[in-house]
Interface confidence: low
């Protein structure tokens, strides 16, 4: 787990002595994990003794896994501590500004791997003095392949005087089985450090090495600890129900044991695009043909294949007898790889073989049907379009089984094949392109290839419950377990009951669960606070999670209201969710910039890609000024935008030619630039008019005012001449055009270049340029505005639209009888754009992509009348009543 | 059970508009597109455009993109569709149809008659 | 946009006997095993029906003497035997890409 390195703060060399590397050891490494009731709680305590004269950097290190929430994190230096305050994101952000202008991470580094997250900080440690590392994390343990299993990372990259990680459980139902391995030790050396034991209600696993039993060798200093510490458990199953009710909370476990499985049809869509190639496609079938091999003789089965065909194997499910297993190894052995990827395809022949139960076999229905997808890629033949995709999976499968899918490398959308599973009843997992690929894949399998029960459904007393996690299960499989919590009315706690339903193999299943008060007193005088505790931050931990999961697969304004309702849960709970952040009171870097504890995506990069590092020195100091340096990002010679009075310009790259028109319309109207229904982005611009209104004369109007928004990210940015503001509707923080910054999240960065522009670039999406126009500070009639310009929208999607979006694709168009206009330096012609013939006129307009200051003239083609003819509809269809 | 109840015949005025609806029920309007489509007395179909309540996305035919206008109100379970600007030529009957790739279940239809 | 052409515009077959109405797509609904055409039958005064989905599978509800076939850019829709209640127009759709289009429709008339 943790680790602590000295690194000289100059350039002296010192002698390590005993256990300390360059003058620094760690004094003791404890993790302490206290279990109630699966709700596991994780105490990390570090102590770096820095023994040399001069400061040291040291670095504390941990992992922890993807799915526990940090809750709580502090650091004591010279008696002085330092505590974490976990606020929403934009609140973090707004606070301490100059870590989000930095761009940095503030020297909090948190990467993702496969089952667990990095969480590395580096602090300068004075001379002769030690400083104390605390971090709480918290998590929900879930039961696969009948145990429950903690995973502690150990890696103290030295040896340490006191190191101990002490495991306490405490199982109301009684625990059943106890086992503890430590991967990294030796048999006999495992035998001796490892102390386990159990008994009734309590469990307790205790690891405590020497020094030297920590040393790879009699006379090494470095360390064996270097590897994963797993505890594993299982409860006693003895009583069918298990329902905890403590403090108006509730939560109920139901894994019923001695059940018949049920037979199952299930059907394969395997993905044999060309990317497959090499060692992904031999891991696939080498997963396939043993998962074949360990069907029963009563499932049935079919495969599909997708590339830029799709082929079935049989194209209608058939039973798992032995000539049949054999003759599908055959095919799976034999077929080859086709060219792109026809997702959509392979997924709607898939779920026609396992709709035909409902259509022509009724003898499978009472099967449990199961859909497995694989694939490594995004679609490319057929059916592209996700959205359109997710709506025709949902429209096939209605509900009938549930989808699980496999995402096979890091070259799949693996969002998209998450909201898809989570819309199906399913989930998704990721197959990492790893030496075990096979192993993955059997592993996954064999969570859902003993189905128990269909359609589970836990109900509780609609009027003693507050709110309630996911009571509906499509299948519990065998090994596994259905958890649900949830608040519970007052005065309604003794009543409470919990009844459940589901289909069997060749039977009904249906029981009532009541709450044994006598056992519930006695389990609160033996563990008192914290089962209330616990039972109480399960339900939370739940509800966050499922929030969160919902979230992805709702529309823009339910979005808004999920990330609300978990971003409150996360505060009020004190998680670190993807909505929060926790920032450290009184910790700044060598410019002041403080660090936030983020959690990362599910895509972070690994460790060795992210930025440079920062140290940080236990000290309030006062931020000093600092600004990166401009983002330099190089545009396109041409662009399409909008700027001054508004004058629309339409670079066309196939004419090599380009179109402007104008938008006369009134100050305080807002009209849609930009708006890609796929996702939901959208730019929106406000007008405003000049200070002093001329009389009789047509007055100039200028966007004064500009929203960019992304809702899958919950992103907006408001743009003035005089501020630039981060999610305004959540009361984010506000910048000036006289700071030079970077800001990132989820996915869109914001680079503000003093006084001059700002560019906003979204993953899979736009990149987009604000130029900042001052005036003349004592002008009586002009205001300073605003200019708008597309830098890059090659991956936004086809039908984006608003007076710039529509033309991000091709727009044909045809220029004739080119002759003298009312003004001879700007010549008339007739062009026949969209069927429609119209009379424009040629002449110059300024581009200030580049130089936002004196521009470029651009020669062009102007369509009158607001643009009539050359955009769909009117330019009023245009108008909007929001800025987001 | 899927039901699509249509709003009732419209008799309108050239040069106006009309607003006319389609309420569902027996399924969950946000997971569903609602398409629109348009049928001239003894004429074929002709598809209007489509709406995901899920996001409010829509797509419109070309040929109707300045003519109709289509919305959704999920409170309600109602799909909504605006003519603007009618002739005699937008007499006909409109259904509104949900689908994933084929119409499955459809409305009644709403006859709309424009004359003077 | 794809253009769906429709034939026969009418057809009249005697009780019992087998018709069939073929639908040409101008460019191909298909990939290698899936085709996204479907088939329709409506009655005077009624909203279409759905009878065959994705070139080939029977609409649930529908008799068997419905049946369609076809891939790529030629698709047909048999009936047989007919009966006296088929008496309607078929209409086939495509749903490859926005817009979605229908044929022209087929008058089944029975003898």
């Known amino acids: 787990l943790g680790s602590a390195t000295g690194r000289s703060k100059s350039s002296e060399k010192r002698q390590a002595v005993d256990t300390a590397v360059d003058g620094v050891f760690i004094r003791s490494l404890k993790v302490n994990c206290k279990v109630t009731s699966r709700f596991a709680h994780y105490v990390v305590t570090s102590q770096v003794v820095n023994t040399a004269n001069e400061a040291r950097e040291v670095a504390f290190d941990l992992e922890i896994p993807k799915t526990a929430f940090i809750s709580d994190f502090a650091v004591t230096a010279d008696g002085n501590a330092f505590i974490g305050d976990i606020k929403d994101k934009v609140t973090a952000w707004k606070q301490y500004r100059k870590a989000a202008i930095s761009g940095e991470n503030a020297g909090l580094v948190r990467a993702s791997g496969r089952t667990m997250e990095q969480f590395t900080i580096h602090l300068t440690v004075n001379p002769q003095s030690k400083v104390t590392f605390q971090l709480t994390y918290e998590e929900v343990l879930k039961r696969n392949h009948m145990q429950y299993e903690i995973v502690i990372k150990v890696k103290p990259k030295q040896l340490v005087h006191h190191f101990e990680i002490d495991v306490d459980i405490f199982e109301p139902q009684g625990i059943s089985k106890l086992d503890a391995q430590a991967s990294f030790l030796p048999k006999e050396l495992a035998a001796q450090t490892i102390k386990k034991s159990f008994s009734g209600k309590k469990g307790h696993v205790l690891f405590r090495p020497t020094v030297s039993q920590q040393q790879s060798c009699p006379t090494c200093s470095t360390s064996l600890l270097n590897g994963h510490f797993k505890v594993t458990y299982d409860v006693s199953r003895d009583k069918i129900c298990d329902l905890l009710v403590a403090n108006n909370h509730f939560a109920h476990f139901f894994a019923p044991q001695n059940l018949t499985n049920m037979n199952k049809n299930v059907v394969f869509v395997i993905d044999i695009s060309g990317s497959m190639r090499g060692q992904k496609v031999k891991q696939t079938k080498e997963a396939l043909l043993k998962i074949l091999g360990d069907m029963q003789p009563g499932d049935y089965f079919d495969l599909v294949l997708f590339g830029t065909r799709v082929q079935s194997w049989k194209g209608s499910l058939v039973q798992a007898s032995e000539a049949n297993l054999q003759a599908a190894q055959d095919f799976v052995r034999g077929f080859s790889l086709d060219e792109a990827t026809n997702l959509n395809g392979g997924l709607l022949r898939g779920i026609e073989i396992l709709n035909q139960v409902q259509e022509s076999l009724p003898e499978l229905s009472n099967h449990a049907s199961i859909l497995i997808m694989l694939t490594d890629g995004d679609p490319t033949e057929g059916v592209t379009d996700r959205s359109q995709i997710l709506k025709n999976v949902r429209n096939a499968i209605r509900g009938r089984f549930p989808l699980y899918n496999l995402g096979f490398g890091h070259n799949v959308d693996f969002n998209f094949l998450e909201v898809m599973s989570m819309e199906n009843n399913g989930r998704a997992q990721r197959i990492y392109e790893d030496h075990d690929a096979t192993q993955q894949l059997q592993g996954f399998y064999s969570q859902v290839a003993k189905p128990l029960l269909v359609d589970v459904d836990l109900q509780y007393p609609q009027d003693a419950v507050l709110a309630l996690t996911q009571n509906h299960h499509k299948q519990y499989y065998e090994g596994s377990e259905i958890v649900v919590a949830g608040r519970i009315a007052d005065n309604k706690q003794s009543s409470f009951k919990a009844d459940v339903q589901a289909h069997g193999e060749g039977q009904e299943f249906s029981i009532t669960c009541l709450v044994d008060e006598e056992e519930m007193k006695k389990l609160l005088r033996e563990r008192g606070h914290m089962l209330e505790n616990h039972v109480e931050r399960l339900w939370a931990y739940l509800t966050i999670q499922e929030l969160l999961a919902k979230r992805m697969k709702v529309d823009r304004e339910e979005r808004a209201n999920l990330s609300s309702q978990a971003l409150q849960m996360s505060l009020d709970y004190g998680f670190v969710t993807p909505l929060t952040s926790m920032s450290i009171r009184g910790m700044a870097d060598q410019d002041g910039l403080k660090p936030t504890i983020d959690k990362p995506s599910e895509d972070s990069p690994p460790l060795e890609m992210l930025g440079p590092r920062r140290t940080f020195v236990l000290s309030a100091l006062q931020p000093s000024p600092t600004h990166s340096s401009s983002n330099t990002q190089r545009l396109p010679d041409r662009v399409t935008g909008v700027d001054t009075d508004p004058h629309f310009i339409i670079h066309v790259p196939q004419k090599e030619d380009t179109l402007c028109f104008n938008i006369n319309e009134e100050p305080g109207v807002i009209l849609s630039l930009v708006q890609d229904p796929n996702t939901g982005f959208s730019v929106n611009g406000q007008l405003i008019g000049n200070k002093a209104r001329s009389p009789g004369q047509h007055d100039g109007t200028y966007f004064g005012r500009l929203g960019i928004a992304n809702p899958a990210t919950d992103f907006q940015l408001e743009v003035t001449p005089q501020n630039i503001t981060l999610n305004p509707g959540f009361g984010g923080p506000v910048f000036s055009w006289r700071d030079q910054a970077v800001l990132r999240q989820d996915g869109v960065v914001v680079t503000i270049n003093k006084k001059r522009n700002l560019v906003v670039s979204v993953d899979d999406g736009g990149t987009f340029e604000v130029v900042l126009h001052r005036v003349w500070k004592g002008s009586s009639v002009h205001q300073d505005f605003l200019g708008f310009y597309v830098l890059d929208s090659h991956r936004m999607s086809a039908r984006t639209h608003g007076l710039l979006g529509q033309f991000f694709h091709p727009i044909g168009f045809e220029v004739s009888d080119i002759h003298p206009g009312s003004d001879p330096t700007k010549p008339d012609a007739t062009m026949v754009v969209r069927n429609r013939r119209l009379t424009v006129t040629r002449g110059l307009q300024k581009d200030y992509s580049k130089d936002p200051w004196h521009g470029a003239e651009v020669s062009c083609w102007f369509i009158h009348n607001n643009g009539a003819g050359l955009i769909d509809g009117a330019y009023t269809d245009y108008i909007v009543p929001d800025i987001f | 059970e899927v039901q699509l109840q249509q709003s009732g015949a419209e008799l309108v005025k050239p040069g106006t508009s009309v607003k006319m609806s389609c309420k569902a029920s027996g399924y969950t309007f946000t997971s569903y597109w609602m398409h629109w489509v348009r049928q001239r007395p003894g004429q074929g179909l002709e598809w209007i455009g489509d709406i995901y309540p899920g996001t409010d996305s829509t797509n419109y035919n070309e040929k109707f993109k300045s003519k109709a206008t289509l919305t959704v109100d999920t409170s309600s379970s109602t799909a909504y569709m605006q003519l603007s600007s009618l002739t005699s030529e937008d007499s006909a009957v409109y259904y509104c149809?949900?689908?994933?790739?084929?119409?499955?279940?459809w409305g009644q239809g709403t006859t709309v008659t424009v004359s003077s | 946009d794809i253009v769906l052409t429709q034939s026969p515009a009418s057809l009249a077959v005697s009780l019992g006997q087998r018709a069939t109405i073929s639908c040409r797509a101008s460019?191909?609904?298909?990939?290698?095993?899936?085709?996204?055409m479907h088939w329709y039958q409506q009655k005077p005064g009624q909203p279409p029906k759905l009878l065959i989905k994705y070139a080939s599978n029977l609409e649930s509800g529908v008799p068997a003497r419905f049946s369609g076939s076809g891939s790529g850019t030629d698709f047909t829709l048999n009936i047989h035997p007919v009966e006296e209640e088929d008496t309607a127009t078929y209409y086939c759709?495509?749903?490859?890409?926005?817009?979605?289009?229908f044929g022209g429709g087929t008058k089944l008339e029975i003898k």
């Open positions: 149809s949900r689908s994933g790739d084929y119409y499955d279940y």
């Open positions: 460019q191909s609904v298909s990939t290698s095993s899936y085709s996204y």
């Open positions: 759709q495509h749903s490859w890409e926005i817009p979605w289009t």
